[in-house]
């Protein structure tokens, strides 16, 4: 049976445009069961870093070590798989970086970085100095193991030099890599020394070797690609949001709910209310009122703005988000102070959310 009684049965409007919460897949880290995994929070100037897993606060335990900007998971198990986030709290703002952990029997690795530069890797040599091929940017080749979500684009690079200018060819699992070996083929950008595969599928898994050669020698470098298949998940809400707030009578306040969902989410802001002086119905369930929900006529459903508040507005506000897989909810409390007990500012307004793109 439902866990609440709605004071107003809100007829749902058509959903808002579908792309608003379509969030690009975060970086994926893959570990085999039993392995240790270390992830560095890729945020700068972090005064305080907090960690969450699937929207729930993550604290240290006998297998999870949190040191500065590093998260270590010892003896990973499939239960460690999920959506992780590190939030850097600064004096003026906060920023969150999301990443996936997938504990499978696949080889441990990180996602591929898209690299827009690369012209600097095309080195021209003095024609007199004959030279065998050599790597010009080994930093871009350090990450040999790449775990990429299915349907993403992968780029492998082997920046090289030599005189005469070397040629580059690619092997897959030690054999010549031909265009017909994969649906959609692949691109080779010789000037960037790169191999690009779009919309990867599980059959793209394997070892990719670049062979760079000229008449004076040959060098090679091998990358391992693992394609991680996704499965849909229920919405995930950023930990700590909405945040408790206080304001004076007549003030304004905003509650923010940051949503992560592949599938279209439906967002509702709900408040416990009283009916005929009672907070609970005859069935013992609390009375709830839907204050706002996502839909065509609803602007930015992730934010609930309250203006000119009264003491009656005090209480618990719930951000409830559902998609076709399941739902999630988090709540915050609003404290309304009499005017003479004003906090530091007349209006206590939280920052509006950055969309998780």
């Amino acid at each position: 049976r439902p866990s609440f009684s709605l004071v107003e049965d809100t007829t749902l409007e058509p959903e808002e445009p579908p792309t608003k919460y379509q969030i690009s897949q975060p970086e994926v880290y893959v570990a085999a069961p039993g392995e240790s995994l270390e992830v560095r929070c890729l945020l700068k100037d972090a005064a305080v870093i907090s960690w969450t897993k699937d929207g729930v606060h993550l604290g240290p335990n006998n297998r999870t070590v949190l040191i500065g900007e590093y998260l270590q998971i010892k003896g990973a198990t499939p239960r460690d798989s999920g959506l992780y986030a590190c939030t850097a709290s600064r004096t003026v703002d906060s920023e969150t970086w999301y990443f996936m952990v997938n504990v499978t029997d696949a080889i441990s690795s990180g996602d591929d970085e898209d690299d827009t530069d690369g012209a600097e890797d095309f080195v021209s040599e003095n024609s007199n100095n004959k030279r065998a091929p050599y790597w010009t940017n080994t930093e871009k080749m350090e990450k040999r193991l790449h775990a990429v979500p299915a349907a993403n684009t992968v780029k492998f690079r082997c920046p090289a030099g030599g005189n005469p200018m070397p040629t580059m060819r690619w092997l897959k699992n030690g054999k010549e890599f031909k265009q017909e070996h994969r649906i959609g083929g692949y691109k080779v950008r010789n000037q960037h020394w790169s191999l690009i595969m779009e919309s990867v599928v599980p059959s793209d898994k394997g070892n990719y070797t670049c062979v760079v050669e000229n008449e004076y020698g040959s060098i090679n470098h091998t990358y391992h690609l693992d394609v991680v298949e996704r499965s849909p998940h229920r919405p995930i809400l950023q930990a700590g949001l909405p945040a408790n707030a206080s304001t004076v009578v007549g003030g304004d306040v905003e509650f923010v709910c940051k949503v992560y969902s592949d599938a279209q989410p439906h967002i509702q802001w709900i408040k416990h209310v009283e009916k005929n002086g009672s907070k609970y119905g005859p069935d013992g369930l609390p009375y709830l009122k839907v204050l706002k929900h996502s839909g065509i006529n609803s602007s930015n459903a992730e934010v609930l703005a309250l203006f000119n508040v009264t003491e009656a507005d005090a209480g618990e506000y719930i951000c409830k988000v559902s998609n076709y897989i399941g739902q999630a909810n988090q709540s915050a409390w609003l404290t309304v102070l009499p005017k003479q007990q004003a906090p530091g500012r007349e209006k206590e307004i939280t920052a509006s959310p950055d969309y998780l793109e």
């Epitope: 579908p18 919309s199 499965s231 849909p232 599938a263 279209q264 439906h266 559902s322 076709y324 739902q327």
Partner: antibody, heavy 114, light 107 residues
């Protein structure tokens, strides 16, 4: 492994009610929606509604609002659909499916006949 | 309600052929579309969700594409076991609606 096991075929008379079950195993039952889908040769697949077992929240297709009642029992990890005031057009195969429609029960055939 | 239209009720194919099953939504549903395969006497089997993501264990000859209102399920090289009924579905907003189905049969 993950499974949705539905109750057996039903033969009922017009005007009666019927309650069919869907027993879930192999996953956290309360954390996923449980959908019900009707299939008839004429109408194809029709979504009836869903229940979120964690808190009992339901969402119905307006077409089935007065026909179907969805419930779930967390302790037995079983979801139920009750169909009332049965008529011949309710004869169909009824499927339950987990949240992402990634796993489906084997279906329960309902025949309404006098 | 959002209407999902599969205009081709039947499609004839041969083993080894490339075939594309299409589906049109009556309004923009983003990438919130799934594809299912159903064989006689069986329950539907999930193939694709969010328009292009293949479920684990689904052969990579099945590819989903599209966004907005037009969606396609492509089988790159049809195998005998692929002869079945294929349904699209929108999981954008309730009521979640299915297409009428496309039956893939041998020429």
């Amino acid at each position: 492994q993950l499974q949705l096991q539905q109750s057996g075929a039903e033969l009922v008379k017009p005007g009666a009610s019927v309650k069919m079950s869907c027993k879930a195993s192999g996953y956290t039952f309360a954390s996923y929606n449980l959908h019900w889908v009707k299939q008839t040769p004429g109408q194809g697949l029709e979504w009836i509604g869903l229940i979120y077992p964690e808190n009992g929240d339901t969402s119905y297709n307006q077409k089935f609002k007065d026909k179907a009642t969805l419930t779930a029992d967390k302790s037995s990890t079983t979801a139920y659909i009750q169909l009332s005031s049965l008529a011949s057009e309710d004869s169909a195969v009824y499927f339950c499916a987990r949240g992402g429609f990634d796993y489906w029960g084997q279906g329960t055939t309902l025949t309404v006949s006098s | 309600d959002i209407v999902m239209t599969q205009s081709q009720k039947f499609m004839s194919t041969s083993v080894g052929d490339r075939v594309s099953v299409t589906c049109k939504a009556s309004q923009n549903v983003g990438t919130n579309v799934a594809w299912y395969q159903q064989k006689p006497g069986q329950s539907p089997k999930a193939l694709i969700y969010s328009a292009s993501y293949r479920y684990s264990g689904v052969p990579d000859r099945f590819t989903g594409s599209g966004s907005g209102t037009d969606y396609t399920l492509t089988i790159s090289s049809v195998q005998a076991e692929d002869l079945a009924l294929y349904y699209c579905q929108q999981h954008y907003s309730t009521p979640y609606t299915f297409g009428g189905g496309t039956k893939l049969e041998l020429k």
